[in-house]
């Protein structure tokens, strides 16, 4: 969708007047909420709640609305000009490198680290080293609440170099 051209991407002489109710293409393009007909002569409205288009376009079909997965909440519904906005449920987050699913936030920080950021729908809790204040990015399964090693025993999952 990011590849769609916008009115700003068009040269000034190609820019079309933003008339939403046009039934024919303007300079070869149809307005948001529409797609072009197979003969290129008409603009056809997207179906509310089923598909959408966000930019001026010459697509022969509207884009299918996203359905929120289980584990997600719908922040806003799909309209003819905007896709559904889904967000991870409380206590879960979506990482950039695995956007296909919501993952559970950690419940605490590894030993020797302190929490400086809460769980949000788009990020896990943020932990920093108590002394240096440097962020912890590697995922460590042993969290404060679950460290059971006795004094003098190295806690191998938490053996981090600053």
């Amino acid at each position: 969708e990011s590849a769609l051209i916008t009115q700003q991407d068009l040269a000034p002489q190609q820019r079309a007047a933003p008339q939403q109710k046009r039934s024919s293409p303007s300079e070869g393009l149809c307005p948001p909420g529409h797609h072009i007909s197979e003969d290129g002569r008409d603009c056809i409205s997207c179906k509310y709640g089923q598909d959408y288009s966000t930019h001026w376009n010459d697509l022969l079909f509207c884009l299918r609305c996203t359905r929120c997965d289980s584990g997600e909440v719908e922040l806003s519904p799909c309209t003819t000009t905007r896709n559904t906005v889904c967000q991870c449920e409380e206590g879960t987050f979506r990482e950039e490198d695995s956007p296909e699913m919501c993952r559970k936030c950690r419940t605490g920080c590894p030993r020797g680290m302190v929490k400086v950021g809460d769980c949000t729908p788009w990020s896990d809790i943020e932990c920093v080293h108590k002394e240096s204040g440097t962020k912890h990015s590697g995922e460590v399964p042993a969290v404060e609440e679950t460290v059971t090693s006795s004094p003098g025993t190295p806690a191998s999952p938490c053996s981090l170099s600053g």
Partner: antibody, heavy 113, light 110 residues
């Protein structure tokens, strides 16, 4: 039918305009597309012009080519050709859902110093 | 711009054999894809449009299928005349996404 003309040997930097002449249909009702093919290479989309004369280009072709049309011809202007622009240039009729259905034989452009 | 990835680059089959060419789009184009045949020194010729509709005069040995991002051109009962390079091209949103052709597949008939 569709026929291209204007292809010739030019030196780098010399602007060149290729012309596509159509007969048997009205270009006021069709989009027209320009495609090129370097010797021994594949087809490369340059851009197209809609029935109402709006031109759109492949991202690599913006600024290097200008497409315009009259009532019976479609022009492709090469603004400042380089040796990499040596190719056979095709003009064709484009229909939105049915693809590029009517092609010209092509015209050869050689850019060399 | 949309990117069309075509495989294989070259294929060799005997007369009477079957060739399968695949084309993958970098984003969904529904069924709006065309296939072209090009012989040396000639312009391309449209074989198939809307992914599976045969153009006028094209023998039924040519078959197109697929939708969304994955498409296939199958040529069965190969004839010597089928030796050519084949290209795919998207037909939805060429102002929006561009209309880049696939890289081409050379079909050699033995």
């Amino acid at each position: 039918s569709v026929e291209e003309s204007g292809g010739r040997l030019v030196t780098p930097g010399t602007p060149l305009t290729l012309t596509c002449t159509v007969s048997g249909f009205s270009i006021s009702r069709y989009a027209m597309i320009w495609v090129r093919q370097a010797p021994g290479e594949g087809l490369e989309y340059i851009g197209f012009i809609t029935s109402d004369s709006s031109a759109y280009y492949a991202s690599w072709a913006k600024g290097r080519f200008t497409i315009s049309k009259t009532s019976t011809t479609v022009d492709l202007k090469m603004t400042s050709p380089t040796t990499e622009d040596t190719a056979t240039y095709f003009c064709a009729r484009y229909t939105y859902s049915d693809g590029t259905d009517l092609w010209g034989p092509g015209t050869l452009v050689t850019v060399s110093s | 711009d949309i990117v069309m990835t075509q495989t294989p680059a070259s294929v060799s089959e005997p007369v009477g054999g079957t060739v399968t060419i695949k084309c993958q789009a970098s984003q969904s184009i529904s069924t709006y894809l065309s296939w072209y045949q090009q012989k040396p020194g000639q312009p391309p010729k449209r074989l198939i449009y809307k992914a599976s509709t045969l153009a006028s005069g094209v023998p039924s040995r040519f078959k197109g299928s697929g939708s969304g991002t994955d498409f296939t051109l199958t040529i069965r009962d190969l004839e010597c005349a089928d030796a050519a390079t084949y290209y795919c091209q998207p037909n939805s949103g060429i102002a929006t996404y561009g209309a880049a052709f696939g890289g081409g597949t050379e079909v050699v008939v033995k």
